[in-house]
Interface confidence: low
């Protein structure tokens, strides 16, 4: 009789596999397995220029885990082409879509350009590509748009060669000329599109009330209603300037609270290049412009200009050592210009204006001097107009402009004054131009 044996039962437990995942278009899956069971996982990686999306929302990464019931814990994401979005506007310029109308996705190309004649592109060539990281990027790797910088030193006037003893300016002759009204009439010269270069003494009295400065650009007639109004955001007076103790370091910058629109009547003056001294040697001709006192002893109605030669520095120093002028007035930070015979000079009311020279290589005008001081009688024979020597202050100018920003904030609030001050009480016997 056969012996009885019990049932042998084998229990085997197989985890429920999850549906086989398929990588989305423009994506790949890792790791690839024959099947995926409980606790197995996979990740999805998108090709360069594509981003992971769950529904409509971007993901940093994606990993799905196979659950006990054989379902994935997350739905499959998609790999969507990166969209850099509309490129930033370019002030004083424009953007053109190269790839196609308003195409802003990965590898799309745009071209920035600046308004012709009055602006030039800085930083790069203006060509930007939508990169995989979602940023419009230039060939040099910059993510911020280029800058349209105003072209400086353009003038309708061809060089003189031969405003006191001067001539009437025509529209566009001195588009950098700025009229500053406040305590008294003064002048300045536009730098870039939101800075004014002037003399420290011209705005010293208003240094703590800069917002009261009435700044006018594009004017030809002093009293004309046709001008562009600007206001000061901040005033920077050279820390080495001491009021009423001579005119050394007689230089100041005014930051405007808004950028001005550049056109044929409003254009900045260039700052001197390193090579500029070769155009400012003794007897080279500079041009001063302003609405200061004329030969008739009145402020000029029309903007006037005068072509005057640079005077040898020693000759100028000697001229101001004679009585009634005390020694040491003319420093290495000054240059002199005028005719030995007199008759052509800048004068009171021209203070702060630019003495400009033509750079024969670039054919652009640059500021070589700032109208500072001179003899009691403008245009006096044997005396000369004294100008702040701008080339000595290029590091100071550039430092302030880079530290305090190229762009006007456009914001409200009162204008501020910035400087280091050491006040000395000392009589002076030169006249302020």
């Amino acid at each position: 009789m056969a012996s009885m044996t019990g049932w042998k039962i084998h229990y085997t437990s197989t985890a429920q596999p999850c549906p086989y995942p398929m990588a989305p278009p423009n994506g790949h899956l890792s790791p690839v397995q024959a099947k995926y069971i409980l606790k197995d996982s996979f990740s999805i990686f998108c090709e360069p220029g594509y981003e992971l999306l769950q529904g409509h929302l971007p993901l940093k990464s994606f990993a799905a885990v196979c659950q006990k019931d054989g379902s994935w814990d997350q739905p499959m994401p998609s790999c969507s082409i990166v969209d850099c979005g509309p490129p930033d506007d370019l002030p004083s310029g424009r953007v053109e879509y190269i790839t196609g109308p308003e195409v802003t996705t990965y590898k799309a190309v745009i071209q920035y350009s600046c308004e012709e004649t009055f602006y030039t592109m800085k930083v790069n060539d203006g060509k930007y590509v939508c990169e995989a990281d979602g940023f419009w990027t230039s060939s040099k790797g910059e993510r911020s748009p280029p800058v349209c910088e105003p072209v400086c030193g353009l003038s309708a006037r061809t060089t003189g060669g031969r405003i006191y003893g001067g001539q009437k300016a025509k529209p566009g002759d001195f588009p950098w000329q700025v009229l500053i009204l406040g305590g008294s009439t003064a002048a300045g010269a536009l730098l870039y599109d939101n800075w004014v270069l002037t003399a420290a003494h011209a705005i010293y009295e208003q240094k703590h009330d800069a917002s009261s400065l009435d700044i006018r650009l594009g004017a030809l007639k002093r009293l004309s209603p046709h001008y562009t109004q600007a206001w000061a955001e901040a005033v920077f007076i050279h820390e080495g300037y001491t009021h009423d103790a001579g005119f050394d370091n007689d230089i100041a910058l005014i930051k405007l609270n808004n950028k001005v629109v550049i056109n044929s009547n409003i254009t900045p003056i260039c700052l001197p290049r390193k090579e500029a001294e070769s155009f400012m040697r003794t007897d080279d001709i500079g041009t001063a412009s302003g609405w200061g006192l004329t030969q008739r002893g009145l402020l000029a109605r029309n903007l006037m200009y005068v072509d005057i030669p640079i005077v040898d520095h020693q000759k100028c120093t000697a001229a101001y050592e004679k009585p009634p002028y005390s020694g040491g007035s003319v420093t290495a930070n000054m240059l002199c210009a005028g005719l030995e015979s007199g008759g052509k000079d800048s004068c009171r009311g021209d203070s702060g204006g630019a003495l400009v020279f033509l750079d024969n290589e670039t054919q652009r005008w640059f500021v070589g001097g700032i109208v500072s001081w001179g003899s009691m009688n403008c245009g006096e024979a044997g005396q000369y107009g004294v100008y702040t020597k701008v080339i000595n202050y290029i590091p100071w100018i550039k430092n302030i402009i880079s530290n305090f920003g190229g762009g006007g904030s456009g914001g409200g609030g009162s204008a501020k004054f910035v400087a280091a001050w050491t006040l000395k009480a000392a009589a002076h016997h030169h006249h302020h131009h």
Partner: antibody, heavy 125, light 107 residues
Framework: EVQLVESGGGLVQPGGSLRLSCAAS????????MAWVRQAPGKGLEWVAT????????YYRDSVKGRFTISRDNAKNSLYLQMNSLRAEDTAVYYC??????????????????WGQGTLVTVSS | EIVLTQSPATLSLSPGERATLSCRAS??????IHWYQQKPGQAPRLLIK???RSISGIPARFSGSGSGTDFTLTISSLEPEDFAVYYC?????????FGQGTKLEIK
């Protein structure tokens, strides 16, 4: 103080159109995704649409797709909802809201942190 | 779409009592649940985000917990101003949905 003020609601016939506006203040508008959420009288809340901070993408619930358009003007700190082909079931108070994005466990999700007081839209003949 | 079911529909309690409101999701939503309070004639107000994260300016008596499909909003000691309708919302799915609400009323 964050403020969202809706306007533009009113009575409109079925098939008609309405444009809602939301004026935002007290925060950096162009940093926020914005949304419209509605609430039918005596009922619960229902998300309608979202627009990303820069206006580059818009999202809608299925029942309003093709009929409603969400848009924004960052220069004016304003959000809009253009509603066309209105139906009776669109009757609701429409709220404008900031939608704060947040990364959580690998994906981007939103919740509604600031709300306006709402504007009533009634679709009836 | 992910359906959120809140319970109870109405909860009657007295000031000083502890309130426990429930929100259940039709599928796992991880911790992507947010709670709002709405009083009659007013807009909703965010109370809790991501299941348990507190919101600045919201009293400490409001707390949240839960993960996956089951979530709870707890009010430790009811104040008279807490009687209102409470909604949960999920952001796990890109089609955001809200629960139907729980009305908390004074007993």
């Amino acid at each position: 103080e964050v403020q969202l003020v809706e306007s533009g609601g009113g009575l409109v016939q079925p098939g008609g159109s309405l444009r809602l506006s939301c004026a935002a203040s007290g925060f950096t508008f162009n940093d926020y995704n914005m949304a419209w959420v509605r609430q039918a009288p005596g009922k619960g809340l229902e998300w309608v649409a979202t627009i990303l901070f820069d206006g580059s993408r818009t999202y809608y619930r299925d029942s309003v797709k093709g009929r409603f358009t969400i848009s924004r003007d960052n220069a004016k700190n304003s959000l809009y909802l253009q509603m066309n082909s209105l139906r009776a079931e669109d009757t609701a108070v429409y709220y404008c809201s900031t939608e704060s994005p947040y990364y959580s466990e690998g994906y981007y999700q939103g919740y509604f942190d600031y709300w306006g007081q709402g504007t009533l839209v009634t679709v009836s003949s | 779409e992910i359906v959120l079911t809140q319970s109870p529909a109405t909860l009657s309690l007295s000031p000083g009592e502890r309130a426990t409101l429930s929100c259940r999701a039709s599928q796992s939503v991880s911790t992507s649940i947010h709670w709002y309070q709405q009083k009659p004639g007013q807009a909703p107000r965010l109370l809790i985000k991501y299941a348990s994260r507190s919101i600045s300016g919201i009293p400490a008596r409001f707390s949240g917990s839960g993960s996956g499909t089951d979530f709870t909003l707890t009010i430790s000691s009811l104040e008279p101003e807490d009687f209102a309708v409470y909604y949960c919302q999920q952001s796990y799915s890109s089609l955001y949905t809200f629960g139907q609400g729980t009305k908390l009323e004074i007993k």
